[in-house]
Amino acid sequence: EKSDLRTVAPASSLNVRFDSRTMNLSWDCQENTTFSKCFLTDKKNRVVEPRLSNNECSCTFREICLHEGVTFEVHVNTSQRGFQQKLLYPNSGREGTAAQNFSCFIYNADLMNCTWARGPTAPRDVQYFLYIRNSKRRREIRCPYYIQDSGTHVGCHLDNLSGLTSRNYFLVNGTSREIGIQFFDSLLDTKKIERFNPPSNVTVRCNTTHCLVRWKQPRTYQKLSYLDFQYQLDVHRKNTQPGTENLLINVSGDLENRYNFPSSEPRAKHSVKIRAADVRILNWSSWSEAIEFGSDDG
C-alpha cells in the first residue's frame, strides 16, 4: 500500500477506511442513521464532498489527487447519537523522493509517452512504476514499456490506449531498499494532452480565377467530429523577399474541409501547408507537407 493511514477518532469508532485503488471511503454502518456525510480536505483547504453511495456507509471520490496529503472526514447521526471521525492520508516517505516534472502526450492517434524525473532526494536504487486508471475505474493499466535512465524508470510508452477514457488518473509509485519513496499522482484529460497529426490528403486544384484547397481531418485518439477542428492554412508565394509576411488563413472545420481563394492565371509558384487543432484548445499540430501549385514563370 502506498501510504500510511492514521485515524483520529473518538472512543466509539466508525472504523473509517479508504481504498486508494477504488477511491472508496467506507465506514461501519450504524443502526437508525438519520444523517451521514463524507468529505475530504486537501492541503490548500479545498473541500470535496461526493455523493453517498446507496448503502450510505461509503462514498467514492471521483477526481482527486492525493500526493499532497488529504484528510478524510465522516459525520454520521443516528437517532441516539452523533459520530465523527477523521482519517489522515499522508504521502509517507522522504520528502522530495517522488517522481517530478510528470507529463504525458498522445501522438499518432494511438500512442502515448509519459515522462518524469527522479525526485531530488531519491536514493540511487530508486525505481518508479506507473499505473493508469480510467475515470470509470474499471481497469488499471500498468506501464508495458518503461523508458530508462541508468536503470531507473523515467518514462513510459503505451501503444494500446483502449483502456483510457476522456479523463484518467496517473499514479507513479516508487520503491527503494533504503528509504520510503513518496508517490506522485495526477489527473489528465486526453483532449488536453493529445498532439494532432497534421491534416491528410491535402490537394490544390486551380481554374483560371481561383484555387481550391481540400483536406481531410486528422485521425485522432479522441473521438472528435468535424466541427471540433480548427485549421490554419499557410499560403506562401515562393521566391519572395525574406521577411515577407506569409498569409495565414483560419478555417473552421466542416463536413467538407475546403478553402477557395482568388488566384488568377498566370499565377506564380505558391505552396500551401495546413495544420489542425482542437477548436477549444488550439494546441496546433505540426504543418502538413507543403503542396506546390503555379509556375516559376507566373
Partner: antibody, heavy 120, light 111 residues
Framework: QVQLVQSGAEVKKPGASVKVSCKIS????????IHWVRQTPTKGFEWMGG????????VYAQRFQGRVTMTEDTSIDTAYLTLSSLRSDDTAVYYC?????????????WGKGTMVTVSS | QAVLTQPSSVSGAPGQRVTISCTGS?????????VSWYQQLPGTAPKLLIY???KRPSGVPDRFSASKSGTSASLAITGLQADDEADYYC???????????FGGGTKVTVL
C-alpha cells in the same frame, strides 16, 4: 452537398414496431456519427440515442431502453431507427442528425423528419 | 418538464436586438457542458445555430451570437429580420440524466 433523406410517414397500431431510415448522400456514413431525436407538441425534443465516444458504442436514452435499436448499413450509407411496442404517446416526428461535435453534442445536419402516428 | 428552462416567447421590432435565456443547473450547463442552440422555422427541421457555447457553423450570420455563464446561457439576435421568426431551442448534456437534453423552446415573433 450533404443531405440526410428520411423515409416517409408511417401509421402504426399500438404494440407494433416501426423502422425509419435515414439515407446519407454526398458523404460517407462511415465517417459520420448519427443521433436520433424525436419531437412532440407536448414533450418537445427528446434525444433517443446515438454514438457515444466515451463508450465507443451506440447508447440509448434510458426511457427508450429495450424498445429502441439503432443500426447502420454503411454499404448503402443508411442509418435505421427501430422502435418497438409502440404506444399512442410515441406519435411524433422522428429526426436523424449528424453529430458535428461530441461536446454538447451539437447536432449539425438534420433530416427533414419522419412523421410516425400510433393509433388504433 | 424541461430541465433547461426557456421563456415561452420573446418579440421585437425589425432591426431590434432580442435575447433568449436558457437556465439549467449544476448537472448540465454549470457542470460545465457545452451549449448548442437551434432554430426551427415553421414546418421544417431544426438548424444548428451555435455550438461550443458561442461558435457558429459556416453559413450562420453573425447576427446570431451566444454566451454562457454559470448555470445559464443566452442567445442574442441583433438586427432582427422577418425571417428570424421561428422557435429557438437550447440544448446541453446532463450528467444526472446521462443524456443530452433540450430546452422547451422560445417562439420569436417579429412585430
Amino acid at each position: 452537398q450533404v443531405q440526410l433523406v428520411q423515409s416517409g410517414a408511417e401509421v402504426k397500431k399500438p404494440g407494433a414496431s416501426v423502422k425509419v431510415s435515414c439515407k446519407i448522400s454526398g458523404h460517407s456514413l462511415s465517417e459520420l456519427f448519427i443521433h436520433w431525436v424525436r419531437q412532440t407538441p407536448t414533450k418537445g425534443f427528446e434525444w433517443m440515442g446515438g454514438f457515444d465516444p466515451e463508450e465507443n458504442e451506440i447508447v440509448y436514452a434510458q426511457r427508450f431502453q429495450g424498445r429502441v435499436t439503432m443500426t447502420e448499413d454503411t454499404s448503402i450509407d443508411t442509418a435505421y431507427l427501430t422502435l418497438s411496442s409502440l404506444r399512442s404517446d410515441d406519435t411524433a416526428v422522428y429526426y436523424c442528425s449528424t453529430v458535428g461535435s461530441f461536446s454538447g453534442p451539437a447536432l449539425h445536419l438534420w433530416g427533414k423528419g419522419t412523421m410516425v402516428t400510433v393509433s388504433s | 418538464q424541461a430541465v433547461l428552462t426557456q421563456p415561452s416567447s420573446v418579440s421585437g421590432a425589425p432591426g431590434q436586438r432580442v435575447t433568449i435565456s436558457c437556465t439549467g443547473s449544476g448537472s448540465n450547463i454549470g457542470a460545465p457542458y457545452d451549449v448548442s442552440w437551434y432554430q426551427q422555422l415553421p414546418g421544417t427541421a431544426p438548424k444548428l445555430l451555435i455550438y461550443h457555447n458561442n461558435k457558429r457553423p459556416s453559413g450562420v450570420p453573425d447576427r446570431f451570437s451566444a454566451s454562457k455563464s454559470g448555470t445559464s446561457a443566452s442567445l442574442a439576435i441583433t438586427g432582427l429580420q422577418a425571417d428570424d421568426e421561428a422557435d429557438y431551442y437550447c440544448q446541453s448534456y446532463d450528467s444526472q440524466w446521462n443524456q443530452p437534453l433540450f430546452g422547451g423552446g422560445t417562439k420569436v415573433t417579429v412585430l
